[in-house]
Structure formats: C-alpha cells, structure tokens
C-alpha cells in the first residue's frame, strides 16, 4: 500500500503544531520529567518491514489521538492549535487504516507485530497513568507534549524510510 504524498506533509505539520502548542518552558518543568521508555527498537525504521510498520504506526497515531482528544486535553491547550493537530492526526490515521484494510491476511510475522503493538501500548499506558497521577497539571502536559513530539518524530522517520524503500 502506498500512503498518499499528503501523509508525509501532515506528519510534518503535526510536528510543527506540537511545537507551537508549547505553553511552558521545559526548564520550568524539570522536576516533572520522566522516562516513559519509548520502544525505539520496536518502531525502528531499520528493523521492521513495511507490512509490520503500518499497524505499529496506526497504533501510535491512535494512542496520540486518544491523549489529545480527551476532555482534560482541551482545557490544557490552545483550542485552534489543538483542533488543527488532531485533525492532521485523524487524516493520518485514516490513511494508515486504509492501508491496513488492504493488508488484511498479509501479516508476515504476527508475533513480532503483536510484540511491537504491545510495546507501543505499554508506552502510552505509562504516559496516561503519569497524567492521571499528576492530575493533568500544566507541567505534566508539557512533559507529555515533548514526549509525544519524540514519538511522532520517530513515526516520521519510519514513514520516510518506507517511502525510500518503494
């Protein structure tokens, strides 16, 4: 499945919007920093084939959307930027799910894929638990925003590699 050209542009725009959404200096939130254990090895462009990458990227995009479409999120961010960001993610998710529909039954390594999907879920579970424990404080959201930027960047790198692979 070939993702549309606009997919890559949306991904870059989402990253830019995430940077613009920043409300606090990361320096003012140093005490709230946390390592969420991003599963780099499971989302690494060099280690996963295209057929496996699509479900993993779809899961990652879905989980980011879940965080930023929550009711607590709408109170934390500039509404215009947040809406644009979520809209871009929705479009990306639609592209990825379109590819997934074409891929049904073509799972080369279902165990490896399940492993990667669960690693992504566990990572986002840590993030959502962190937000709950920090009572969705402004600093907690800033830490999560920066962390999600990292996850989205990684996703963009995988997409870039998949395009080159064609």
């Amino acid at each position: 499945c070939d993702l549309p050209q606009t997919h890559n542009l949306r991904n870059k725009r989402a990253l830019t919007l995430l940077v613009q959404m920043r409300r606090l200096s990361p320096l003012s939130c140093l005490k709230d920093r946390k390592d969420f254990g991003f599963p780099q090895e499971k989302v690494d462009a060099q280690q996963i084939k295209k057929a496996q990458a699509i479900p993993v990227l779809s899961e990652l995009t879905q989980q980011i959307l879940n965080i930023f479409t929550s009711k607590d999120s709408s109170a934390a961010w500039n509404t215009t930027l947040l809406d644009s960001f979520c809209n871009d993610l929705h479009q990306q998710l639609n592209d990825l799910q379109g590819c997934l529909m074409q891929q049904v039954g073509v799972q080369e390594f279902p165990l490896t894929q399940e492993d990667a999907l669960l690693a992504v879920r566990k990572y986002f579970h840590r993030i959502t638990v962190y937000l709950r424990e920090k009572k969705h404080s402004p600093c907690a959201w800033e830490v999560v925003r920066a962390e999600v930027w990292r996850a989205l960047s990684s996703s963009a790198n995988v997409l870039g590699r998949l395009r080159e692979e064609k």
């Epitope: 989980q63 165990l111 669960l118």
Partner: antibody, heavy 122, light 107 residues
Framework: EVQLVQAGAEVKAPGESLRISCKVS????????ISWVRQIPGKGLEWMVK????????IYNPSFQGHVSISVDKSITTVYLQWSSLQASDTAIYYC???????????????WGQGTLVAVSS | DIQMTQSPSSLSASVGDSVTITCRAS??????FHWYRQKPGKAPELLIY???NLQTGVPSRFTGSGSGTECTLTITSLQPDDFATYYC?????????FGQGTKLDVR
C-alpha cells in the same frame, strides 16, 4: 499455550532471605507485564508489584515497597520476588500473573501461576 | 488507595439459580473493573474484564455491567463449578486493589 509455572512451597525462619520464581512460556516474554499478588491463607488478594520485562520498569504497591523486590532474567524468561529478611506476616500464597493491555489501555490479569506457598515460622 | 467494597460478603444459592454480586469503588474507576473466580485450593481465574467483556472460554452465563463507581457480576443458571469466591478488581489507579471477596456456597 501461555504458562506461568511457579516454584514449590518454601518453609523459612524469620529473618531469612528468600527468592521465589515464576517461569513463563508460550508467548513473547517482553510483551507483557508481570505482577505478583499475595493471598494470606483464608484472606483476600493484594497486588504487590509489577514489572515490564522489556526494560525492568517497576511499580510497587507502597504497602510492600522496601520489603520485597521484583526482578527478571530475560535469558530464561523468569520473574523473581525476593525478600532479604522474612517476617511471620509474610506467610501467604504468592501468585505471579500476566497483564493483558487492551487498545484502550485497560490492563487486567489474564493468566495466573499456580501459586507458591511461603510459610515463615520459628 | 481506591477501596473496593463487594456485597454481599457471602451468598447461598442452588444449582440453576441466578445471583448478582455488586462492587463499589471509593472513586470513579471508569470501566477498569474486572472480575475473578477462585475455586478452593486453586489460583484465581479471569471472568470479566473492562466491566463487561467476557474473557475467552468463559461461559456466557457470566455477565458484567456498570462503570464509574459501581459494577455488577451476574451469574445465571448456576453450575456446581460456580460455587467459589468471587473478587472484583480495579486497575485504574495504583496500587491496584481487589474487593474483599464474595463467597458463593450451596444452599
């Protein structure tokens, strides 16, 4: 088939150290968290601690923190629960359990070991 | 900690009966409610997860419902195997907590 096989019963004296094990098989070890649950004979269930075998990230129940420690050996797909100094109140059955995590990030205990009875008595 | 309170603590019934067990959380746990059955001398086993989802292999006579601070487990057409202790659990907040258990015995 998913299996969590626990070590046999242990009888110890107060003050002694102990490590009990849970050997898992039938799935990718690093994909799922493992927790330990305590059950004092005739009583209810208490969650103690969980670990992510992928990176050994742990979360303890504050009631048990400092008294027990959890660890993993990825090479032999085994999770351990350890005490450096047992007390009579540690007498209980200890279960290792696997967590499943849904897409909506709800986790629950989908597989249980058979339990290890630890008896601490002078 | 989130307290989980089950009612009743014990219950007598006969084969073929229907019973309902309730679990209340001290604060909202959304749908992070789960139910387990423990037969005497055995490890607990998962029945229902996320308040209402039946675990694979569990008979459909077990049903779960509710969310927020209260959930219920209903067993219809009780079988001899069902006389056991039932526990609810929440995994919404750390530490995870269980209800005190409901012992279901033969009338």
């Amino acid at each position: 088939e998913v299996q969590l096989v626990q070590a046999g019963a242990e009888v110890k004296a107060p003050g002694e150290s102990l490590r009990i094990s849970c050997k898992v098989s039938g799935y990718t070890f690093t994909s799922y968290w493992i927790s330990w649950v305590r059950q004092i004979p005739g009583k209810g269930l208490e969650w103690m601690v969980k670990i992510d075998p992928r990176d050994s990230y742990t979360i303890y129940n504050p009631s048990f923190q400092g008294h027990v420690s959890i660890s993993v050996d990825k090479s032999i797909t085994t999770v351990y629960l350890q005490w450096s100094s047992l007390q009579a109140s540690d007498t209980a059955i200890y279960y290792c359990v696997r967590h499943y995590l849904t897409q909506s990030l709800v986790d629950y205990f989908d597989h249980w070991g058979q339990g290890t009875l630890v008896a601490v008595s002078s | 900690d989130i307290q989980m309170t089950q009612s009743p603590s014990s219950l007598s019934a006969s084969v073929g009966d229907s019973v309902t067990i309730t679990c209340r959380a001290s604060q909202s746990v959304s749908n992070y409610f789960h139910w387990y059955r423990q037969k005497p001398g055995k490890a607990p086993e998962l029945l229902i997860y996320s308040a209402s989802n039946l675990q694979t292999g569990v008979p459909s006579r077990f049903t779960g419902s509710g969310s927020g601070t209260e959930c219920t487990l209903t067993i219809t057409s009780l079988q001899p195997d069902d006389f056991a202790t039932y526990y609810c659990q929440q995994t919404h907040g750390y530490p995870f907590t269980f209800g005190q258990g409901t012992k279901l015995d033969v009338r």
